[in-house]
Structures are given as C-alpha cells and as structure tokens.
C-alpha cells in the first residue's frame, strides 16, 4: 500500500523558520503534489504550495521555496513572520496524487518537545486518505 | 471543458483604475491558481502575478507590486485584477490563465488615453 | 530574474519544410531534485490568446501533433517543427518555468512562404 510520510522541522538559526518535509513510498509515478496547512486539501485546509514534476512549483506566503528534493519527495521551507510562533502548533498536510494508485495524503506537526535544528522523526500518519 | 471568460475592453483616463474579471467554469475553482499576465501591443509576455483561491497571500512580479492587486470571489468563481494608476505604459491586452499557464483567458485589452 | 532569450526572432519557411528555434536561459532551469528542466512552450497564433504547446522542456500538451519537438538541459533549448504546415503560422514564446518571477521569451514569429 502506498504511504505518505511528513516530517516537520524547525531551523536551529531561526526560530521563525521550518520547513515542511515530505515524500510518497510506492510503486506509481508523482503527478502533482499538494501542501496545505491547518488541515487537509479540500477539508478546511489553506493551500501552500504546488509542485508537478515537470511544470515547476509554485507557493504562496507564508511558504518561502517549495522544491523538489527527489522523484518522491519534497520540501517547503515556511517563514513566520509574526511574533509569535503558530507554525508550532500547525498541522501540514501534503497530497500526493500519483498513477496509477490515486491520491494519498498525510499530515504531521512539529513535535512539541522538538529541539531547533532537530528533524523530526517520521510523523504517524493521522490522515491517509486515498481518493 | 475549461473555460475562463474574462470581461470586456476598457478605456480608461490617465491616472484611473480599472477592475478586470475572469470567470472560471468548468473545474472546481478552488483547485487551481490564477496567473495574471500583460502582453503589450506586439510585444512579448510580462507575468504579472499568480493568487489561489483559498490563500489572501497572491504573489507579485516585483514590477507590478503596488500596480496590481489579485483577489477573487469562490462564490462566483470569478478572480479580478484591479489596476490603478494608470498610464500609456499599462495600455495592453491582459490575460488570466489557470494552473500551469494551461488554459488563457480570452484577454482584456485595456487603453489607457485621455 | 531569469532572463530567456529567443532566436532568431523571425523566420520563413515554406509548408513541409523543417524548422528549428533556440531559447536561451540566463540561469540553468534544471532542478537537480528530480533531474527535470522546467521549461515550456507556447504558440500564439494571431488573435489568439497564447497555448500550451510543450512543457519540461519535450513533453507535449495533450492534443499537440508530434511534429513539435522540445529537447536541450540547462540554458540552451530548442523547439522543432518537423513539417510545418500552414496552421503554425504563430508566434512561438519559452518560459522560465524554474523560479518567480515566470518570465518569457521575447518570441519567434514563424511564417509561411
């Protein structure tokens, strides 16, 4: 069965900094990735940032720079501009539509005992949905 | 079939604004990102901006921050482009373009003339 | 910003003929997470609001005939028309696809003899 994994990670220099990890582990090929916050795509969440393989990525603030880290995975690098922190008690959502397997998404947040500059471990997956 | 019908040509005085439309039918909306695009006459493509329609946070093309303004409306499926300001320079067809650049609206050509 | 630069600006070739157009990128549109080049092509034709025509850099949009060809990595990329035929009489755009702000080609305007 395909499985979604979500890593969240806050910068050890900048507080206000994360970044979003994710990638799909199965057998299909990626056709567009979707991240959103505050719940999933489509069920109250806030789209942050498109990528498709071959069309490029596009995000939107408070996302900085989504990319591609691998065929299967990507990351999304957050800046919190307000004084104080949200991003760490936020959920991240991220949908991997793929072929010929449907759509699977998980989310994850920043652990709350998560030293700066730590990855967190795999998050559980909360939400695994195929649509 | 996909379609985005934009609003009609305006002429418009030096100095106004003008609030452009784009009518989205055929998709679901709030799944796909608007882009906003100028293309002068006989000239090339300018990108002008992109917004989505479940984030207040559009991204600008430095160039047209503070001449440009992206919102949309879910309830009618209709993204705007309001642009103030205006001079000869922003005379040109504007179009909207949903996704990737995949599918164009079928442009607003505005005049900018006293 | 990434500056693309088309060439030759205009060209004339007649119907059946094999015609080729460069895109030259200021900065590399590769990204070396998935090894693609997020570079497109589009087609105007008079009139017309431009069409998707080719995408990371040689896959074509669904309904493109096959005679338009994208290849090329990095800075340097190139559009063929196999055999061109009447209906191409358009000008031809490559976009940066890589990184904001999009940015475009100034065009080659293709005509036929």
């Known amino acids: 069965t395909p499985e979604v994994w979500v890593q969240v990670q806050m910068e050890a220099t900048e507080l206000s900094s994360f970044t979003v990890h994710c990638g799909f582990l199965g057998p299909g090929s990626i056709s567009l990735v979707t991240v959103s916050w505050g719940g999933p795509d489509g069920a109250g969440g806030t789209k942050l940032a498109v990528l498709h393989p071959e069309l490029g990525t596009r995000q939107w603030a408070p996302a900085r720079q989504a990319r591609w880290e691998t065929q299967s995975s990507i990351s999304l690098a957050l800046e919190d501009s307000g004084a104080s922190s949200p991003f760490a008690n936020t959920t991240f959502c991220c949908k991997f539509a793929s072929f010929p397997e449907g759509s699977w998404e998980s989310c994850g947040s920043l652990p709350p005992s998560s030293d700066p500059g730590l990855s967190a471990p795999p998050t559980p997956v909360p939400i695994l949905r195929a649509d | 079939e996909v379609q985005l019908q934009q609003s009609g040509p305006e002429l418009v005085k030096p100095g106004a604004s003008v609030k452009i439309s784009c009518k989205a039918s055929?998709?679901?909306?709030?799944?796909?990102?608007m882009n906003w695009v100028k293309q002068s006459h006989g000239k090339s493509l300018e990108w002008i901006g992109d917004i989505i329609p479940n984030n207040d946070s559009p991204n600008y093309n430095q160039k047209f921050k503070g001449k440009a303004t992206l919102t949309v409306d879910k309830s009618s499926n209709t993204a705007y482009m309001e642009l103030r300001s205006l001079t000869s320079e922003d005379s040109a067809v504007y179009y909207c373009?949903?996704?990737?650049?995949?599918?164009w609206g079928t442009g607003t050509t505005v005049t900018v003339s006293s | 910003d990434i500056v693309m630069t088309q060439s030759p600006s205009s060209l004339s070739v007649s119907a059946g003929e094999k015609v080729t157009m460069s895109c030259k990128s200021s900065q590399s549109l590769l990204n070396s997470g998935n090894q693609k080049n997020f570079l497109a092509w589009y087609q105007q034709k008079p009139g017309q609001p431009p069409k998707l025509l080719i995408y990371g850099t040689s896959t074509r949009e669904s309904g493109v005939p096959d005679r338009f060809t994208g290849s090329g990595s990095g800075t340097d990329f190139t559009l063929t028309i196999s055999s061109v035929q009447a209906e191409d009489l358009a000008v031809y755009y490559c976009q940066n696809d890589h990184s904001y702000p999009w940015t475009f080609g100034g065009g080659t305007k293709l005509e036929i003899k």
């Open positions: 373009a949903s996704g990737y650049f995949d599918v």
């Open positions: 055929g998709y679901t909306f709030t799944d796909y990102f």
